[in-house]
């Protein structure tokens, strides 16, 4: 096992968004480990009444792309592509504001679900953001 690498997505939980495209994984076993975590998280989300339709439409693919980021094909070394910061901020502050507040105060959810911090992501106009993963949130277009 060495540094991170790229491999086809082989899971089920995020297959409708990722298909069998190449994703960045930190290690050989990570894809299975993350798949188990996100499956458990989605099961929990599915039984929750706290998730609105307007939020889930974009939050679910966003969480999938955060868990299983596409490989950056422009990089000479295996590297994950970031989510787009503008979409991340709209998701957190507008579409899913209530849901994020609830999730961040619920340790059971946080144990299974990883929520991206928009401040981690490169600024929209920066070179690093040029290849970000765009979910397709209309307000960010």
């Amino acid at each position: 096992e060495e540094d991170g690498f790229c491999q086809p997505y082989r899971g089920i939980a995020c297959a409708r968004f990722i298909g069998n495209r190449t994703v960045y994984m930190e290690s050989l076993h990570m894809q299975g480990e993350i798949e188990n975590q996100i499956t458990a998280a989605f099961t929990m989300i599915g039984t929750s009444s706290h998730l609105s339709d307007k939020c889930s439409q974009f939050a679910i693919p966003s969480l999938c792309h955060y868990a299983f980021p596409y490989c950056d094909e422009t990089s000479s070394v295996p590297k994950p592509r970031d989510l787009c910061r503008d979409e991340c901020e709209i998701l957190e502050n507008v579409l899913c504001q209530t849901e994020y507040i609830f999730a961040r105060s619920n340790p059971m959810i946080l144990m299974r679900l990883k929520l991206p911090n928009c401040e981690d992501l490169p600024q929209p106009e920066s070179p690093e953001a040029a290849n970000c993963i765009r979910i397709g949130i209309p307000m960010a277009d």
């Epitope: 975590q37 868990a67 970031d82 144990m111 990883k114 929520l115 981690d120």
Partner: nanobody, 111 residues
Framework: EVQLVESGGGLVQPGGSLRLSCAAS????????VGWYRQAPGKQRELVAR???????YYADSVKGRFTISIDNSKNTLYLQMNSLRAEDTAVYYC?????WGQGTLVTVSS
């Protein structure tokens, strides 16, 4: 804005110990994996140790049995306990999470 800040480096004699810390701004549990890399003068950066959110760990062969990686989610901090240090462990040590990197902390092992 710096998201990961390392500390704990310094000068230590061979056989000695150090504990490196990496403080994350915001929740460190937002990452699926976090790790430590190092870069010695004139050498490529190499992975030292990694810990996943599921608790599994990885260590480079050169540090196995001597280094221990751990995480404290309540303090949003990643640690690297380094024992039985050798001259070849001299390097700048970097904390990493996905595409985020700290500024590094220098570890010098010398008598």
């Amino acid at each position: 804005e710096v998201q990961l800040v390392e500390s704990g480096g310094g000068l230590v004699q061979p056989g000695g110990s150090l504990r490196l810390s990496c403080a994350a701004s915001g929740s460190i549990s937002r990452f699926y994996a976090v790790g430590w890399y190092r870069q010695a003068p004139g050498k490529q950066r190499e992975l030292v140790a990694r810990i996943s959110s599921g608790g599994s760990t990885y260590y480079a062969d050169s540090v196995k049995g001597r280094f221990t990686i751990s995480i404290d989610n309540s303090k949003n901090t990643l640690y690297l306990q380094m024992n039985s240090l050798r001259a070849e462990d001299t390097a700048v040590y970097y904390c990493n999470a996905r595409n985020l990197w700290g500024q590094g902390t220098l570890v010098t092992v010398s008598s």
